[in-house]
Amino acid sequence: EVEKTACPSGKKAREIDESLIFYKKWELEACVDAALLATQMDRVNAIPFTYEQLDVLKHKLDELYPQGYPESVIQHLGYLFLKMSPEDIRKWNVTSLETLKALLEVNKGHEMSPQVATLIDRFVKGRGQLDKDTLDTLTAFYPGYLCSLSPEELSSVPPSSIWAVRPQDLDTCDPRQLDVLYPKARLAFQNMNGSEYFVKIQSFLGGAPTEDLKALSQQNVSMDLATFMKLRTDAVLPLTVAEVQKLLGPHVEGLKAEERHRPVRDWILRQRQDDLDTLGLGLQG
């Protein structure tokens, strides 16, 4: 906390400009009006304030808005956002996607900080669901965002938002998360034709049940081994050798290279040797 001192004569700030970088901390505290700062927040980022000076500016805003900053101020926080604690952010009510983007831009290129996580949580909870535009924005800044959500949080994602999901957004999702996302993707893409449907659904198949895999095996989809390796063990085990052969098409030869890895190993173990021999790959059940 900066001690309360009177502003020296002639130093009272009439606007937020570069002259303020020469002010000592106590002078900023005494000479910058919080209301002026709030209305001219957009100028702060153009001025090379020190971290100590930014602390003073934050302190002034905190005094002016003890219940939390209004969105008009939040949108223009810029680098001052990095000074905010999760506790500060929990007081905010951020409803504009533009505000969210502005703050995410400040943290761009860095891992998701506790501040950003809190901001996103507040924003999504305020909207009630993870809509397509929000998901588009979040995955653009943080490709792993979707997979950082719990299965319970993912359940609030409407099927329409699934169109915004790119394959790389699902790279770090675990089986429980894909279990939630797959039915939504199936619903979202249900009106697409066979080959187009498979292209879209492919990255969600880690949540697919056996019956859906059996259905896909009848559609000449030629699933690659990387996708097959991500399928649920319980969904793969009941598949027959003939079904796996149809599902993988020309990629079936890749089973040999993966025979010691799950779920291929589990599946091989539970097949009749005579059936495996029909593949001509030398797989041992």
Epitope: R260, R265, G285
Partner: antibody
Framework: QVQLQESGPGLVKPSETLSLTCTVS??????????WSWIRQPPGKGLEWIGY???????NYNPSLKSRVTISVDTSKNQFSLKLSSVTAADTAVYYC???????????WGQGTMVTVSS | DIQMTQSPSSLSASVGDRVTITCRAS??????LNWYQQKPGKAPKLLIY???SLQSGVPSRFSGSGSGTDFTLTISSLQPEDFATYYC?????????FGGGTKVEIK
């Protein structure tokens, strides 16, 4: 519920063969989802997986022990067994049998049996 | 073989503390990672399977996360009965391997 019980000699001489049996009760060794493993733990050390068997007789062994290990299954007795040949003092450990569910992990363990290799 | 490296090898904590144990695989193991708890003189007990799924009957203060090569076991609020040794284990490759263990002791 399924329970496992190890049995066998607690003392084995160097260069001889260690033999242990695991009896499965409350369930079948022929379960579709289960493989049956042996795991050991030397005194004061960590866990080392030895190998598993499926009811069909298919086996999978730890490469570092493969040349000395044989695991077999007797579905009629609801048992599976471990044989470890040419033992040395380094094979002294608590030996556990365990069930691995294909969808989870080693979810059921025996209480373990201490085997000492000494002359 | 896939090497599993656990850290720390031991830690001291108090009842109520949040405890995090990490496990790193020498190559990607997808989500085929299990966590076990072992108390002296007892067999290990399965806590978490498939990296993040809680085994039936295990308290919800235990949670797991991660995929690929980096995994975490978290105990949200340590209880007296949680002082034990914890092991991670990969089952992706046919040659199963365990981490070296993390001993959680009372501070």
């Amino acid at each position: 519920q399924v329970q496992l019980q190890e049995s066998g000699p607690g003392l084995v001489k160097p260069s001889e063969t260690l033999s242990l049996t695991c009896t499965v009760s409350g369930g079948s060794v022929s379960s579709y989802y289960s493989t049956w493993s042996w795991i050991r733990q030397p005194p004061g050390k960590g866990l080392e997986w030895i190998g598993y068997i499926y009811y069909s007789g298919s086996t999978n062994y730890n490469p570092s022990l493969k040349s000395r290990v044989t695991i077999s299954v007797d579905t009629s007795k609801n048992q599976f067994s471990l044989k470890l040949s040419s033992v040395t003092a380094a094979d002294t450990a608590v030996y556990y049998c365990a069930r691995e569910d294909a969808l989870t992990g080693f979810d059921i363990w025996g209480q373990g049996t201490m085997v000492t290799v000494s002359s | 073989d896939i090497q599993m490296t656990q850290s720390p090898s031991s830690l001291s904590a108090s009842v109520g503390d949040r405890v995090t144990i990490t496990c790193r695989a020498s190559q990607s193991i997808s989500s085929y990672l299990n966590w076990y708890q072992q108390k002296p003189g007892k067999a290990p007990k399965l806590l978490i399977y498939a990296a993040s799924s809680l085994q039936s009957g295990v308290p919800s203060r235990f949670s797991g996360s991660g995929s690929g090569t980096d995994f975490t076991l978290t105990i949200s609020s340590l209880q007296p009965e949680d002082f034990a040794t914890y092991y991670c284990q990969q089952s992706y490759d046919a040659s199963y391997t365990f981490g070296g263990g993390t001993k959680v002791e009372i501070k």
